[in-house]
């Protein structure tokens, strides 16, 4: 007996799709060998239709695919737009068609059920609304209009124009008779139930002159859309429930083992704590549609999700829903990066953000997740250089190390910086990731003066002390601007050779400005890095004065409150999804720090590289 297993018989109807799962023992050889779906011919040969190596036969082009799930020992063959010609005997297997491991599958595609002539078919999901159209002749215009449901050989009255309503349809059905001249009446049924499924008969008038029209109502439980996403990546559930529920509370829930549905998030402010920091419910469009984004996907996020509408913000029978089955692929293309980064008060963090390496030209963003109401994510910085005003001098987004990773540096940390941040781009939305910044006890490793006032035309020397553990790191000074941090020449004054006794006090790197000009005023960062991987940074503000003043004065721009017109990652997620960003920075106007002219030698050059660095604290 072959160890490959699958469905022995698959039956469907024309125009439908099938999803055939085949199971195999997940040995390392089996996991990586070729998978195929072939059709057995009269000669006994089995002709490949689709394989895991990318082959798709001409009559399957555009309607079939094969997906391997090596970690599970399964592969899935999806075939759409079935026709009667697809009926036949097939094999799903591993290796070579003629020999190797396989399983026989019989596929039968039929025409679908026979219906009375002229029957109109209405296919609607449970909870939605259907409008059944019933034509009639002029002579029946003044006569009784009615809708019956056929149950076996009998017809049960559902509604009529004399105000009768069958109790099973109470409060969710209406019969509309148009004005004169229109020879059609309609029956509207809201909040469809599975039990509404069946054959209906419209009738106008009575006796031999009556008008009749058959309607076949197919009420479907929404078929879960299969969604496959990578571990650590992001998923977006787009939920369009129709105008009828545009003003009703919306929710996303996850079906549990008891068959109830636990609310993940809703528009009434409820959110499952397991999704803290990594979920947003985007405000609805006028048509009532909305979307939910979940980042930092975990294996335990797998399951069946339903979105729906109900005034209670949770699942209720007979209300519209949409369904997804989420699978999280552990063999992820998204690299591992720390989900928690720790820094000390006054110190810094350097966060590595993954992006799709095929999209090196995409715009990069970093936003702060806020949990209030449905969640939002105001953008703090972007690769075009715009930085939220209150982050001036302490936040920068760098293209390094490149090749699928960018870096965000935040310094002058306070306890208020603790929270969840999202890395994202205007490209592949599945690469959105979440990082939590935690502020822990400790001292910054890099020490710079707190107040620096430079005198115009004179020489200024700013020291930056670093501990012995950074002796092998590259040290640098840079001048911060809202487009980056331009590296400046600096002098490492500590011994550069390997040493036995590390004198903490002698380890310093200095920045010299000679002569000081007006353009030198601003924020300067002292930092350490290894190649293109950034470590800690410390920031110092340099004020420039006309003449020498007794004592020193520290000039610091006051930290601004959050701009009321800040840009926010909310409904804009949709625009990113649709790649239809006119303003790719995600909606609403935004106050930005104006570029302050000459930035000491132009903007920082970025260099592409790869690999990874620990993410941790830094200095002020």
């Amino acid at each position: 007996k072959s160890p490959v297993f699958g469905p022995q018989e698959v039956s469907s109807v024309e125009g439908n799709s099938v999803s055939i799962k085949c199971y195999y023992p997940p040995t390392s050889v089996n996991r990586h060998t070729r998978k195929y779906w072939c059709r057995k011919g009269a000669s006994g040969r089995c002709i490949t239709l689709v394989s895991s190596e990318g082959y798709v036969s001409s009559n399957y082009a555009g309607r079939a695919n094969l997906t391997n799930f090596p970690e599970n020992g399964t592969f899935v063959v999806n075939i759409a737009q079935l026709s009667r010609d697809d009926s036949g005997h097939y094999k799903c297997g591993l290796g070579i068609n003629s020999r190797g491991l396989s399983f026989d599958v019989s596929l039968e595609v039929s025409q679908g059920p026979e219906l009375p002539n002229g029957t109109e078919v209405y296919t609607v999901d449970v909870g939605r609304t259907v409008t059944i159209k019933c034509p009639f002749k002029t002579e029946n215009a003044p006569k009784t209009k009615a809708l019956y449901k056929k149950i076996g050989q009998t017809s049960v009255l559902v509604i009529d124009s004399r105000n009768y309503v069958n109790p099973n349809y109470k409060d969710r059905i209406r019969l509309r008779i148009p004005g004169t001249g229109q020879l059609i009446f309609t029956v509207v049924i809201d909040r469809l139930r599975l039990s509404d499924h069946g054959l209906y008969l419209c009738q106008a008038g009575d006796g031999s002159n009556r008008d009749e029209k058959n309607a076949d109502l197919q009420v479907l439980e929404p078929e879960p859309e299969l969604v496959y996403e990578d571990l650590r990546g992001s998923v977006t559930f787009h939920c369009a429930l129709g105008l009828e529920v545009a003003n009703v509370a919306k929710f996303l829930c996850r079906v549990n083992s008891r068959e109830t549905c636990d609310v993940v998030i809703n528009t009434l402010g409820k959110r499952d704590s397991a999704f803290e920091g990594r979920i947003l419910l985007n405000p609805q469009d006028k048509d009532g549609s909305f979307s939910v984004v979940i980042t930092g996907l975990r294996k335990e996020d797998e399951g069946r999700y339903l979105c729906g509408a109900h005034s209670d913000g949770q699942l209720q029978e007979g209300w519209p829903i949409q369904a997804w089955q989420l699978f999280v692929n552990e063999e992820s293309t998204i690299p591992r990066s720390p989900t928690v980064v720790k820094g000390v008060a006054g110190g810094s963090v350097a966060v590595l953000c993954p992006y799709n390496p095929k999209e090196s030209q995409s715009l990069k963003y970093w936003c702060l997740w806020e949990g209030a109401q449905n969640g939002r994510c105001p953008l703090l910085v972007e690769s075009q250089g715009l930085v939220q005003e209150q982050y001036e001098g302490r936040l920068s987004l760098l293209q390094e190390p490149g090749n699928g990773t960018f870096t965000v540096i935040l310094n002058q940390l306070t306890t208020q910086d603790a929270g969840f941040y999202w890395c994202l781009t205007n490209g592949d939305t599945r690469w959105r990731t979440t990082v939590e910044i935690k502020i822990i006890e400790g001292e910054p490793n890099l020490k710079v003066p707190g107040n620096v006032t430079a005198v115009l035309g004179e020489t200024l020397n700013i020291p930056c002390h670093f501990p012995c553990k950074f002796s092998s790191y590259e040290k640098y000074w840079c001048k911060w601007s809202n487009t980056g941090c331009q590296t400046l020449p600096s002098q490492d004054e500590g011994p550069s050779e390997a040493f036995v006794n590390c004198d903490e006090n002698s380890r310093l790197v200095s920045l010299t400005l000679n002569p000081v000009t007006r353009a030198d005023e601003g924020w300067y960062w002292c930092g350490v890095k290894q190649g293109h991987f950034y470590g800690e940074t410390a920031a110092v503000y340099v004020a420039v004065e006309e003449k020498k003043v007794a004592g020193s004065r520290y000039v610091s721009p006051a930290k601004a409150d959050a701009a009321p017109d800040e840009k926010v990652l909310d409904s804009g997620v949709r625009e990113i999804e649709n790649k239809a960003i006119q303003d790719p920075r995600l909606f609403a106007e935004e106050k930005v720090v104006a570029d302050t002219g000459d930035q000491a030698g132009g903007s920082r050059a970025s260099v592409d590289s790869s690999s990874s660095e620990e993410q941790g604290g830094s200095s002020k």
Partner: nanobody, 130 residues
Amino acid sequence: QVQLVESGGGLVQTGGSLRLSCAASGRTFSPYAMGWFRQAPGKEREFVAAIRWSGATTYKYVGDSVQGRFTISRDAAGNTVYLQMNSVKPEDTAVYYCAADRVPKDISIDPRNPKDWDYWGKGTLVTVSS
């Protein structure tokens, strides 16, 4: 809560036929898959057959030991599943359990694995006499 009730078990002679039924009921229960397992005294629970559906599409799975002899089907409403047992053998003697699943779960879930089914009936005894 979901209830599964099996019926149709009993005594049958070798080579004979029997038809088991399993009815699902409970709050808004419309299963996604239903199946049959069996357990002979002192043995592990064994997969017999399963049927899974999605709209107008149906998938039928049959265990190796009953292939060609047993067939699985369901009623139009999808709440009752049948196991048609033909050409029965003494080794088919066992308690037959109905199983059901409301949710299409992870791609790795194998219908042959009892752990992957959410709901179970109490069982019906089938005895095949020689």
